[in-house]
């Protein structure tokens, strides 16, 4: 049994890091493998992650972490029974993938303005809370070419757009994702999308 693709990990910089790797053949990850991880810190304890299958030869493990900060560094040991298959390390702050924003809502009752709001996925005491920027994707269900991205570079989790910038009388969907420049993160996954029917009064022409 050998590791074909070494584990690569990303952290949500809150409580979970996800590591993925591939074996050289079909593997029952949860029964045959264990990923041991330990913070390189005084008094830290070793933890064991039981991986799940991710395709025939692929495995994924969700590592639970407390109080994640930029100085943290973890040792990782991948075991198959008594055999050490791979040894590595992981610094969560250098491989951050933020949590996806939630609770995306479209408010259509503001005069001819669409107000999109969503929730910051981090608590106020997490460093990322004040450092997320967002991308909002809006698209038409009827017209695949009607697809747009709005970059939200301010901290408030909201976006206002004129309803007239979208076509009237058709349905649209929106979703939002986040990233943080300070840790050079990847983009988060997209939030679940939300749907609304866009209708507004055409301006009266003289």
């Amino acid at each position: 049994m050998k590791v074909l693709q070494e584990p690569t990990c990303v952290s949500d910089y809150m409580s979970i890091s996800t590591c993925e790797w591939k074996m050289n053949g079909p593997t029952n990850c949860s029964t045959e493998l264990r990923l041991l991880y330990q913070l390189v810190f005084l008094l830290s304890e070793a933890h064991t992650c039981i991986p799940e299958n991710n395709g025939g030869a692929g495995c994924v493990c969700h590592l639970l972490m407390d109080d994640v900060v930029s100085a943290d560094n973890y040792t990782l040991d991948l075991w198959a029974g008594q055999q050490l298959l791979w040894k590595g390390s992981f610094k969560p702050s250098e491989h951050v993938k933020p949590r996806a924003p939630g609770n995306l809502t479209v408010h259509t009752n503001v005069s001819d303005t669409l107000l999109l709001t969503w929730s910051n996925p981090y608590p106020p005491d997490n460093y990322l809370y004040n450092h997320l920027t967002y991308a909002v994707n809006i698209w038409s269900e009827n017209d695949p070419a009607d697809f747009r991205i709005y970059n939200v570079t301010y901290l408030e989790p909201s976006l206002r757009i004129a309803a007239s910038t979208l076509k009237s009388g058709i349905s649209y969907r929106a979703r939002v994702r986040a990233w943080a420049q300070c840790y050079n993160t990847t983009w988060s996954e997209w939030s679940p999308s939300t749907k609304w029917h866009n209708s507004y009064r055409e301006p009266f022409e003289q």
Partner: antibody
Framework: QVQLVQSGAEVKKPGASVKVSCKAS????????MHWARQAPGQGLEWMGI????????SYAQKFQGRVTMTRDTSTSTVYMELSSLRSEDTAVYYC?????????WGKGTLVTVSS | QSVLTQPPSVSAAPGQKVTISCSGG????????VSWYQQLPGTAPKLLIY???KRPSGIPDRFSGSKSGTSATLAITGLQTGDEAVYFC????????????FGTGTKLTVL
């Protein structure tokens, strides 16, 4: 919000021991290390040791090795610092502080006076 | 005895800028991150800066931190009378055993 509530002031005789408590609330107790530091009157801060509330293991500054013991009670989310063989130089305000590499939150402090 | 050295005192007028230095060595500041604490008269210390330059939520951006080699600096701009306090730097040292030294402390007086 996070609160670290420390026990009240103590007056002790030289050679005695003192046990200071620090009750934590507003966060997951076993997820954060706890430090202890002290400050003699008009002096700076001095680090004493750290405890991992999850497993209960502790590590102490070399200066206090053999005289200090840090423990925890997960059922009450409380950490304790006991200092033995007290001398007058141990007169200080003793603080618990939550954190790992730095101290996010501090208790208000407990004044321990050692006097004959 | 602290291994992190700070000036005993600094002073400046309201609205001015002041800097406080913290000098250490290769086994502590040089190899770790620096934090800064503010201790107002008669109160417990409060975290002001961590990770060399990050502010906890609620700390105004008048406070900033930096690190270079084995030294660190706390800068306070737009000084206010409420900033009058003692400021301590802190870090950790893993040279022999893990320890968390603090700086000697700097008393800031707002004139």
């Amino acid at each position: 919000q996070v609160q670290l509530v420390q026990s009240g002031a103590e007056v002790k005789k030289p050679g005695a021991s003192v046990k200071v408590s620090c009750k934590a609330s507003g966060y997951a107790f076993t997820s954060y290390y706890m430090h202890w530091a002290r400050q003699a009157p008009g002096q700076g801060l001095e680090w004493m040791g750290i405890i991992n509330p999850s497993g209960g293991s502790a590590s102490y500054a070399q200066k206090f090795q053999g005289r200090v013991t840090m423990t925890r009670d997960t059922s009450t989310s409380t950490v304790y610092m006991e200092l033995s063989s007290l001398r007058s130089e141990d007169t200080a305000v003793y603080y618990c502080a939550r954190g790992k590499y730095w101290m996010y939150d501090w208790g208000k402090g407990t004044l321990v006076t050692v006097s004959s | 005895q602290s291994v992190l050295t700070q000036p005993p005192s600094v002073s400046a007028a309201p609205g001015q800028k002041v800097t406080i230095s913290c000098s250490g060595g290769s086994s502590n500041i040089g190899n770790s991150y620096v934090s800064w604490y503010q201790q107002l008269p008669g109160t417990a210390p409060k975290l002001l800066i961590y990770d060399n330059n990050k502010r906890p939520s609620g700390i105004p951006d008048r406070f900033s931190g930096s690190k270079s080699g084995t030294s660190a600096t706390l800068a306070i701009t737009g000084l206010q009378t409420g900033d009058e306090a003692v400021y301590f730097c802190g870090t950790w040292d893993t040279s022999t055993v893990w320890e968390w030294p603090f700086g000697t402390g700097t008393k800031l007086t707002v004139l």
